[in-house]
Interface confidence: low
């Protein structure tokens, strides 16, 4: 016996059973893994008085203690609809079905005399049907429904007389059913029987407050189990060759402070006082845990040496229950001031260490949904996915001997103290219906798929490809707004006067009259932070640099009456100095952010983008920039992520749609101006960049979620793409969806009606498609009332906790970018596409492994889109060059310009032009390839300012 569970929290360096990798494990379960599903008789059978069944303590408890619950008589009626249960089992494809026998259905008053024939027939028919279907029965003898007569006559489990009566009942079951049953469970979760039945009074028989009674009941349950095990072991195992255990339930707990010895001690005590209470005598040394014996000496019964010997080892495997009943209500739990956790993997590790690595059957696992949830139980899928992934990690990474898994439960039914207010079934049952049809929920479809694949297959993404991007591919890095230096940092050559320093007197400079020196023209090197920019860019080895101008700096008044020439000179310097390094600029004219709209003050005060005249002001500003920088800049972005301005103009949907309308017009005016006035001489290209995350249905088994995913793309991307790339008008699907909500009185929003002139103005005003893509969102349909953009969409987002995510909870889902590119091409035709921003936040200041993983995986998917899907992808701009202080860490450089290791990774991808085959020698000609200029780099680094 080992008893070393506390090591799980110490995380001592020599012991790391839990692999700390965040990555979800795509793998299969062992070949003969035992997949099952369970129910409890009282929860699903119904018919509490039918065919001679006697009342149980729960039938009585319901009538006396539970308000608003008439009986379990409604329930799912499994006693009547046996065939429907069998069909449900067939549907899922389980290897075993765990169910319990209702003791009072076989023996109405609990005493083993002549069994109730109808009850016997029911269980016999069920077992025969299971065997016929090759479904292994796992039979629980006692799942809380003690015959009421035994409670009233003997005081129930408080009286050790029950031990022998229970053994008689078990003997009968072994005799009648043992030929068809290879797995037996004596008692389901004895902790709850004792603690809630006699301590809190929340369970039948509803006694409370007597701690001595609680531990007496626990003692008798353990002894009853042990007696039955020995009975089976001696008299039935030799010819029936089955296995027998007891299902023990528990929570899991984490210390407040992982380094604190006292907190770890409390966590160990918490586990020991719940799971150890029963596991120690049965799976451990035969006695109660030492901590319990010391603390509860006045109320905890004592095992004699002979009894300890008798208790020890009375289970053929460890049957473990991990579900809501051990977690709620929280105020009755042995939390010891620590943090309750749903980490099943760690609980399994604790069992492994504490009880010497037993074979484990997860005999109950699952969560619950609100009773109003019918078949679309989306959160249940994710709870199951999380639990199953933890079990798989425990098996594969921690070498824990889990041999089977019981999903709980087959059917919606009576949920103990929660009665019918929650649902735990994988099949939905309408309790008010006559036929009690079993309708598969999404979780049933999901579990079925897991069983069919024996785990998690990596279906979402195709294998990595080897190949290269074209020679003219833009390898970029994106920066947000560059604030221009208002004064050049080196004015020493621009002042023609000579000065003498009065060093000994007043220490001032005195101008020498009559002397004029030669000045030199202003130089780009006068700006200090340009040097920093260039240093960083040179290290990135990119071919393109995307940055944004600050509209408010260039035109402080919002019109051309006051042009900040110094700001324009600064931006021209950034572009021209970059070109000397072989780095072309993609310039964004307007880059609003959450905190700052970036508009010139006068425009901001005149209602910003709610005012149509802002679009005209933008056109004038764009014209100035084209004129001043267009000879050097060949790629322009008018507005960055106008589809995200909804975050700012969110007082009402109509504000949002009005602002969006003016942004579209602003872009179109700028594009038309460039097309008419500047394109002939400058030959550049103009677009706007849209925030373009992909969307997947949170629940792939719910058609409403598929529609919500498409609707997300309509409201997020098509909202701007459709008018510009395609029709000149908003997407019909979006317009109709908002209108339909309007008609039903759920929203007062309406998309603006475009005139024919406006449609003509907007249509076709893009030279390429620019997308900012960061992640994939999991969306679900939820009807929302209200007149804001967010509620107009009827969409909620779901965070999948099993996925690799960043500190800001951006999920790393590489295949989403490929799906996005294909969707764009399918909807808007074959055009040049640039990914103008793509990246992830990573806490690491040096070895940013998450960013390297992200870049590698996302670029793989972009390459697949290029090579396999033939998408005309022209460039990828990683986001972003340098991080900003106290903002999420998206940068390749820290805010004080320290380089991170992802730079070298990106360098390597750029120099290879992707992921070429070994020994691939597909080089580009010198004219095509931007070769790095070593002298330029040297000059950039050494040039004195």
């Amino acid at each position: 016996f080992s008893g070393d569970g506390r090591a799980i929290w110490s995380k001592n360096p020599n012991f790391t059973p839990v692999n700390e990798s965040q990555l979800f494990l795509y793998d299969t379960f062992p070949k003969n893994f035992f997949w099952g599903i369970g129910t409890g008789a009282l929860q699903v059978e119904g018919s509490w008085k039918k065919d001679g069944k006697g009342p149980s303590i729960w039938d009585h408890f319901i009538h006396t203690h539970l308000k608003n619950v008439s009986s379990t008589n409604g329930s799912s009626d499994s006693y009547i609809f046996l065939e429907k249960d069998l069909s449900a089992l067939d549907f899922i494809g389980v290897s075993f079905y765990q169910f319990s026998i209702s003791w009072p259905r076989l023996f109405p008053d609990g005493i083993v005399t002549v069994a109730n024939a109808k009850g016997l027939q029911y269980y016999s028919t069920l077992l025969d049907a299971l065997v016929l279907r090759n479904i292994e029965p796992i039979v629980t003898l006692y799942h809380w429904d003690l015959p009421l007569a035994l409670q009233e006559k003997y005081g129930g489990w408080k009286n050790d007389t029950i031990i022998d009566i229970f053994n008689d009942y078990a003997t009968y079951c072994f005799q009648m059913f043992g030929d068809r049953v290879k797995y037996w469970i004596t008692i389901h979760n004895p902790y709850l029987v004792a603690w809630h039945g006699y301590g809190t009074g929340m369970h039948a028989p509803g006694e409370k407050g007597n701690l001595a009674a609680v531990y007496t009941v626990g003692h008798n349950l353990i002894k009853a189990h042990s007696k039955v095990w020995h009975n089976y072991n001696t008299h039935f195992r030799p010819h029936q060759k089955g296995w027998l255990s007891i299902t023990l339930g528990s929570h899991w707990i984490e210390p407040n402070r992982s380094e604190n010895t006292m907190d770890i001690f409390k966590c160990q005590q918490s586990m020991v006082s719940v799971l150890g209470w029963f596991a120690n005598p049965i799976h451990g040394d035969g006695d109660y845990p030492e901590g319990m014996r010391k603390k509860l000496f006045s109320v905890l019964p004592i095992f004699s040496e002979a009894e300890k010997h008798e208790m020890r080892g009375t289970a053929d495997f460890f049957a473990f229950s991990f579900g809501p009943n051990n977690f709620k209500p929280l105020n009755t739990m042995a939390k010891m001031g620590q943090n309750v956790s749903l980490n099943l993997r760690e609980a399994l590790n604790w069992i492994k260490l504490e009880y010497n690595n037993p074979r484990i059957l997860i005999a109950e696992n699952g969560w619950f949904t609100d009773s109003r949830v019918k078949t679309e139980d989306t959160t249940a899928i994710y709870m199951m996915k999380n639990f199953l992934s933890q079990v798989l990690q425990a098996i594969r990474l921690d070498e824990i001997r889990v041999f089977g898994y019981t999903a709980w439960s087959l059917l919606d039914g009576f949920e103990w103290q929660d009665a019918y207010t929650i649902r735990r079934g994988l099949f939905y049952v309408d309790f008010n219906s006559k036929q009690k049809e079993r309708k598969p929920k999404s979780s049933a479809h999901y579990y079925k798929q897991i069983i069919r694949e024996n785990g998690f297959s990596l279906k979402e993404s195709t294998p990595d490809v080897q190949g290269q991007f074209p020679c003219d591919f833009s390898w970029g890095v994106t920066e947000s707004v560059l604030k221009p230096e208002s004064v050049a940092s080196s004015p020493q050559f621009s002042d023609p006067h000579l000065y003498v320093w009065n060093a000994t007197g007043n220490r001032l400079l005195h101008r020498v009259e009559g002397v004029r020196l030669k000045t030199r023209p202003a130089q780009c090197t006068d700006f200090v932070n340009i040097k920093k920019q260039l240093e960083m860019l040179a290290r990135m080895k990119v071919t393109h640099y995307r940055f944004a101008l600050d509209w408010a700096s260039v035109l402080p008044t919002g019109n051309l009456s006051a042009v900040n020439r110094q700001a324009l000179r600064y931006y021209r310097c950034v572009v021209s100095e970059g070109l000397k390094l072989g780095i072309s600029a993609m310039v964004t004219l307007y880059y609003p952010t959450h905190a700052h709209l970036g508009l010139p003050e006068p425009l901001l005060h005149a209602d910003g983008w709610l005012n149509p005249s802002t679009a005209e002001a933008f056109q004038a500003y764009a014209g100035l920039c084209f004129q001043e920088l267009g000879d050097l800049v060949k790629l322009w972005i008018t507005i960055n992520e106008p589809n995200r301005l909804s975050d700012i103009y969110n007082r009402s949907g109509n504000d949002t749609y009005g602002a969006a309308h003016n942004l579209l017009v602003a872009h179109a005016l700028a594009w038309r101006l460039y097309d008419r006035q500047f394109r002939p001489s400058q030959r550049g290209a103009v677009s706007l960049s849209l925030h373009a995350d992909w969307a997947e249905p949170a629940n792939p088994y719910a058609d409403s979620h598929w529609r919500a995913a498409e609707r997300f793309l309509q409201f997020e991307i098509a909202w701007f793409a459709e008018p510009l790339f395609k029709t000149g008008d908003y997407p019909a699907a979006m317009r109709e969806y908002i209108a339909s909500k309007h008609r039903r009185g759920l929203s007062s929003s309406a998309l603006p009606r475009l005139t024919e002139a406006e449609r003509r103005l907007l249509k076709g005003t893009v030279d390429f498609c620019a997308l900012n893509h960061f992640t994939t969102r999991f969306v679900m349909h939820e009807q929302l009332a209200g007149s804001r953009y967010d509620s107009d969409r009827d969409i909620q987002f779901l965070q999948d906790i099993t996925r690799l995510s960043s500190p800001t909870r951006l999920a790393v889902i590489p295949w989403g970018v490929r799906k996005l590119l294909r969707w764009v091409r399918r909807n808007y035709g074959d055009m040049d596409i640039y990914i103008t921003a793509s990246g992830i936040d990573d806490q690491a200041l040096e070895d940013d492994r998450l960013r390297k993983y992200y870049l590698g995986k996302y670029l793989q998917e972009v390459l697949k889109a290029y090579l396999i899907d033939k998408v005309r992808i022209k460039g990828y701009y990683a986001f972003k060059l340098a991080e900003e202080k106290s903002k999420p860490r998206f940068g390749f450089f820290t805010s004080d310009f320290k380089a991170k290791s992802s730079i070298q990774f990106y360098n390597k991808v750029i120099s290879s032009r992707g992921f070429p085959f070994e020994n691939s020698s597909s080089r580009c000609s010198q004219t095509q390839e931007n070769t790095e200029c070593t002298v330029c780099l040297f000059l950039v680094q050494k040039k004195p300012l």
Epitope: S442, H445, R452, P697, N699, Y701, D703, H705, W706
Partner: antibody, heavy 124, light 109 residues
Framework: QVTLKESGPVLVKPTETLTLTCTVS??????????VSWIRQPPGKALEWLAH???????SYSTSLKSRLTISKDTSKSQVVLTMTNMDPVDTATYYC????????????????WGQGTTVTVSS | SYVLTQPPSVSVAPGQTARITCGGN??????VHWYQQKPGQAPVLVVY???DRPSGIPERFSGSNSGNTATLTISRVEAGDEADYYC???????????FGGGTKLTVLG
């Protein structure tokens, strides 16, 4: 381009078994969201659904004809086969196969592509 | 099993609006799909999920569904719209496809 094409005998004698084949192209029968239905239409009458096969090989049959129908698929040949036993003159009809897009298991988006139909006459 | 009831025929003048109904017990909670079938041709899906139009189907075709009635509306009817129209649902209880009896749309004149 997605197409479905029905093939089978033009004439069947009473009590014989009818075997119809639907050959599909432009999509895979393995695709998790695709299913195929058989529908028939007696001359001058309404459409009558017969059977459906899902991507995971689950099948569903019209209650009134269940005992006579079998639907199956051969993914490698891109074919769905319907057999109907004990044919009778009232089974004279045009038989269509149609693709159904099924999101997430059991939610029809309707039958978006149909074959041109094959006319079967039952007569001695 | 689930039954869908359609009127046998509907007549409408060119340029007017035709409404074809499909009745069923609480049909509003089901998804309804509509098909157009011209003589000698296979049916064509014109509306799915109550009101969505497949690509290539004119905007004149629209659908609605609530209570016990689903409706296919064809505005600005043209002579080429003359055909049989069928409604269809997927009955989740029985896992069956159910068609209505069909409605013959006649364009007058």
């Amino acid at each position: 381009q997605v197409t479905l094409k029905e093939s089978g005998p033009v004439l069947v004698k009473p009590t014989e078994t009818l075997t119809l084949t639907c050959t599909v192209s432009g999509f895979s029968l393995n695709n998790a969201r695709m299913g195929v239905s058989w529908i028939r239409q007696p001359p001058g009458k309404a459409l009558e659904w017969l059977a459906h096969i899902f991507s995971n090989d689950e099948k569903s049959y019209s209650t009134s004809l269940k005992s006579r129908l079998t639907i199956s698929k051969d993914t490698s040949k891109s074919q769905v086969v319907l057999t109907m036993t004990n044919m009778d003159p009232v089974d004279t009809a045009t038989y269509y196969c149609a693709r159904s897009v099924v999101t997430g298991g059991y939610y029809y988006e309707g039958m978006d592509v149909w074959g041109q139909g094959t006319t079967v006459t039952v007569s001695s | 099993s689930y039954v869908l009831t359609q009127p046998p025929s509907v007549s409408v003048a060119p340029g007017q609006t035709a409404r074809i109904t499909c009745g069923g017990n609480n049909i509003g909670s089901e998804s309804v799909h509509w098909y157009q079938q011209k003589p000698g041709q296979a049916p064509v899906l014109v509306v799915y999920y109550d009101s969505d139009r497949p690509s290539g189907i004119p905007e004149r075709f629209s659908g609605s569904n609530s209570g016990n009635t689903a409706t296919l509306t064809i505005s600005r009817v043209e002579a080429g719209d003359e055909a049989d129209y069928y409604c269809q649902v997927w009955d989740g209880n029985s896992d069956h496809v159910v068609f209505g009896g069909g409605t013959k749309l006649t364009v007058l004149g």
